[in-house]
C-alpha cells in the first residue's frame, strides 16, 4: 500500500477519506487505527457502528469521528481540533472476523496555524530519515454535514 498524506492546520478540522470497492467490502465494518512504530501494531482509534446497516451514523471517540458511505464506498474520518500530537501514520481498515484488511495508509501532517505566532517547534513533520515512497499529498478542507444531509441507510 502506498501512503497518502493528509495535511491539516493545527486547531482546525481535518477530513480523511478512504475509498474502497463497496462490493468487495460489503457487510464489513470499518475502523481507523494509529500505527505504533514502523513495524508495530495498529491501535484502534474508532470503528463504525456495530451494526453495518447503521455505518452511515457518525461515531466519535474523543475528537475523532468515523462515518461510512457503504454504497459509494468511501470511509471518512474527521479529526477535530487537530493537534501536533495527532500527526503520524494511520490506517483505514475493513474488518472481517477479528482480522482487518488495510484500505489505505494515511500520513497525517499538522501544519502551523498561520494566524498563531506561537513557537511551531513542536509541530510534527516527517524527518528525512522517514521515507514514504510514492506518498500522495492531499490538502483536506472539511465541513460538517448539513441538517437532513445524512445519507439514507442501505437496505438489506
Amino acid at each position: 500500500h502506498n501512503t497518502t498524506v493528509f495535511q491539516g492546520v493545527a486547531g482546525q478540522s481535518l477530513q480523511v477519506s478512504c475509498p474502497y470497492d463497496s462490493m468487495k467490502h460489503w457487510g464489513r465494518r470499518k475502523a481507523w487505527c494509529r500505527q505504533l512504530g514502523e513495524k508495530g501494531p495498529c491501535q484502534r482509534v474508532v470503528s463504525t457502528h456495530n451494526l453495518w446497516l447503521l455505518s452511515f451514523l457518525r461515531r466519535w471517540n474523543g475528537s475523532t469521528a468515523i462515518t461510512d458511505d457503504t454504497l459509494g464506498g468511501t470511509l471518512t474520518i474527521t479529526l477535530r481540533n487537530l493537534q501536533p500530537h495527532d500527526a503520524g501514520l494511520y490506517q483505514c481498515q475493513s474488518l472481517h472476523g477479528s482480522e482487518a484488511d488495510t484500505l489505505r495508509k494515511v500520513l497525517v501532517e499538522v501544519l502551523a496555524d498561520p494566524l498563531d505566532h506561537r513557537d511551531a517547534g513542536d509541530l510534527w513533520f516527517p524527518g528525512e530519515s522517514e521515507s514514504f515512497e510514492d506518498a500522495h499529498v492531499e490538502h483536506s478542507i472539511s465541513r460538517s454535514l448539513l441538517e437532513g444531509e445524512i445519507p439514507f441507510p442501505p437496505t438489506s
Epitope: D21, M23, K24, G27, L51, W52, H96, G97, S98, S156
Partner: antibody
Amino acid sequence: EVQLVQSGAEVKKPGESLKISCKGSGYSFRSYWIAWVRQMPGKGLEWMGIIYPGDSDTRYSPSFQGQVTISADKSISTAYLQWSSLKASDTAMYFCARSRTFYYDSSDYFDYWGQGTLVTVSS
Amino acid sequence: DIQMTQSPSSVSASVGDRVTITCRASQGISSWLAWYQQKPGKAPKLLIYAASSLQRGVPSRFSGSGSGTDFTLTISSLQPEDFATYFCQQADRFPRTFGQGTKLEIK
C-alpha cells in the same frame, strides 16, 4: 438461481499439471469471494484459499501456499485452481464455494458450493 | 492456525431424538462460527452462521449456540434426512479451519 458448476473428474499422473474450474451463475460473480476447499478420501474439509474475482485479490492457507495457484476470470465468471506438478497426495475432492459476508457480524461464510471435482493422481 | 475440535466424532440416534454436537475452538472466536451438513458424495450445505443464525431454507429444528470457544449444534427432533456428517468452521481468522466432522448415524 445461484449456481457454481465445476469441471469434471480428472485422472492424472504424478508430475503432470492440472487446472480445474468453477463457473458461477445467477449472481454477480465479480462481487463475491470464491474459496477452494479440499476433502481427501474419507476425511474432513480443508480451506485452501480464497479469491475476489473483481480484482483477483487472493489469500492462501499457509498449508497450500506455493503448492497451488488460485485465479479467476471475471469476464467469464470462472474461478480456477491449478497445480504445476501433481503428487499422489493431491488425490481428493475439490470444492469451490461462494463466500458471503453477513452484515450481522461482518464475517463471511460459504453459502453456495459447487458439486466438487474429483482429482485422482496415480502412476 | 485455529484448531476446531468436534465431539463426538460419531453418534447413533433414532428419528425423533434430540441430538447435540459440540465444537471447541483452540482460541476465542467470538461468534464467528458456522455449521455445515454434508451427505455422502455431495457438497456441504450451510446450516448456521454467526453461531446461531439459521440460514434461509434450513428447518427450524436446527439451532446453534455458543460464543468464545464453545459452541453447540442442536437438532431438536431428528428426521430421516438429517443423517449425515456435520462440520463446524471458524470465520474469525485466516486460514479458515473446520472441525474434523461428526457422523450422525441411524441407531
